[in-house]
Amino acid sequence: PKQTLPKPIIRAESTYMVPKEKQATLCCQGSYGAVEYQLHFEGSLFAVERPKPPERINGVKFHIPDMNSRKAGRYSCIYRVGELWSERSDLLDLVVTEMYDTPTLSVHPGPEVTSGEKVTFYCRLDTATSMFLLLKEGRSRDVQRSYGKVQAEFPMGPVTTAHRGSYRCFGSYNNYAWSFPSEPVKLLVTGDIENTSLAPTDPTFPDSWDTCLLTRETGLQKDLALWDHTAQNHHHHHHHH
């Protein structure tokens, strides 16, 4: 079998949801000594980067200017050390937002509920879309999908204090082109005093985790780079598997 290098880690800097006409930044973290990185979009080569000096840099940033629906989709990256190529990274879905219209998000029975109550979010958008998405702030990887002609419902079932937080919804014109976000709806879940004070909120991985922690090797940074690679691998699997 043909020898390959370990696959790199691809991630979006700050967020994978990029407003139309704004810039996206993708990071490909490979290995010190990599002489070339390639970014692929929907299976075709999109961009190339050659780090200098290669032995001091463990990854690169790819800038995608002027985001639009043509550049929204699945990205991956590979890298090369000498003549040896790596395996392909996992796929990263890059979404363009702020397309066309703004949906309205509401919650029933209301934004203030008691632990154990059944809650349903409703996302409404009058223009042609059939898929709706609900996201909790700070958990943008955990997208709930629902279908409907003009409105979709998102039943949450009996809620706990873990459901507390701010929610937004989008209408989706395809998997990678979303509407403007709705205004946020803040869900407040109260329990009895004992439970409320003790109930931990759901552990979140804020979007700011998705920053590009690329390092220049200076000796001391070897350990940091190793920790970073391990941590990001853990984070990646948490969200995508």
Epitope: Q23, L45, A47, E49, R50, K52, H63, P65, D66
Partner: nanobody
């Protein structure tokens, strides 16, 4: 936006050479990563060569590697494509394109990365 005008195309015999130029106006060329693409009749637009904004790193596909060389002169606001050992299959309209990227070193090979395009110059290689 930047305005791009290609020149230098023409009719040449197989094995010959041409040098295409792309003059930029409206904005300084150093603000853009640049590329050359070509389109033959009835075929899709094809990537030919690209150069990064500041570092001058270049990339070309195997079909033209060793024959075509992309370069830029930011002081003259001009992009070049030196084409040697031309083949009949190089016949096409050649376009230059600009990508307004903050990256000094990214090389863009995909047409969707480019926002500004010239009108094109015809290159015909006879056998």
């Amino acid at each position: 936006d930047v305005q791009l005008v290609e020149s230098g195309g023409g009719l040449v015999q197989a094995g010959g050479s041409l040098r295409l130029s792309c003059a930029a106006s409206g904005r300084t060329l150093s603000s853009y990563a640049m590329g050359w693409f070509r389109q033959a009749p009835g075929l899709e637009r094809e990537f030919v060569a690209a150069i990064s904004r500041i570092s001058g790193d270049t990339y070309s596909p195997d079909s033209v590697k060793g024959r075509f060389t992309i370069s830029r002169d930011n002081a003259k606001n001009t992009l070049y494509l030196q084409m040697n050992s031309l083949k009949p299959e190089d016949t096409a309209v050649y376009y230059c394109a600009a990508s307004a990227t903050p990256s000094a070193t990214n090389i863009y090979t995909n047409q969707y990365a480019y926002g500004d395009w010239g009108q094109g110059t015809q290159v015909t290689v006879s056998s």
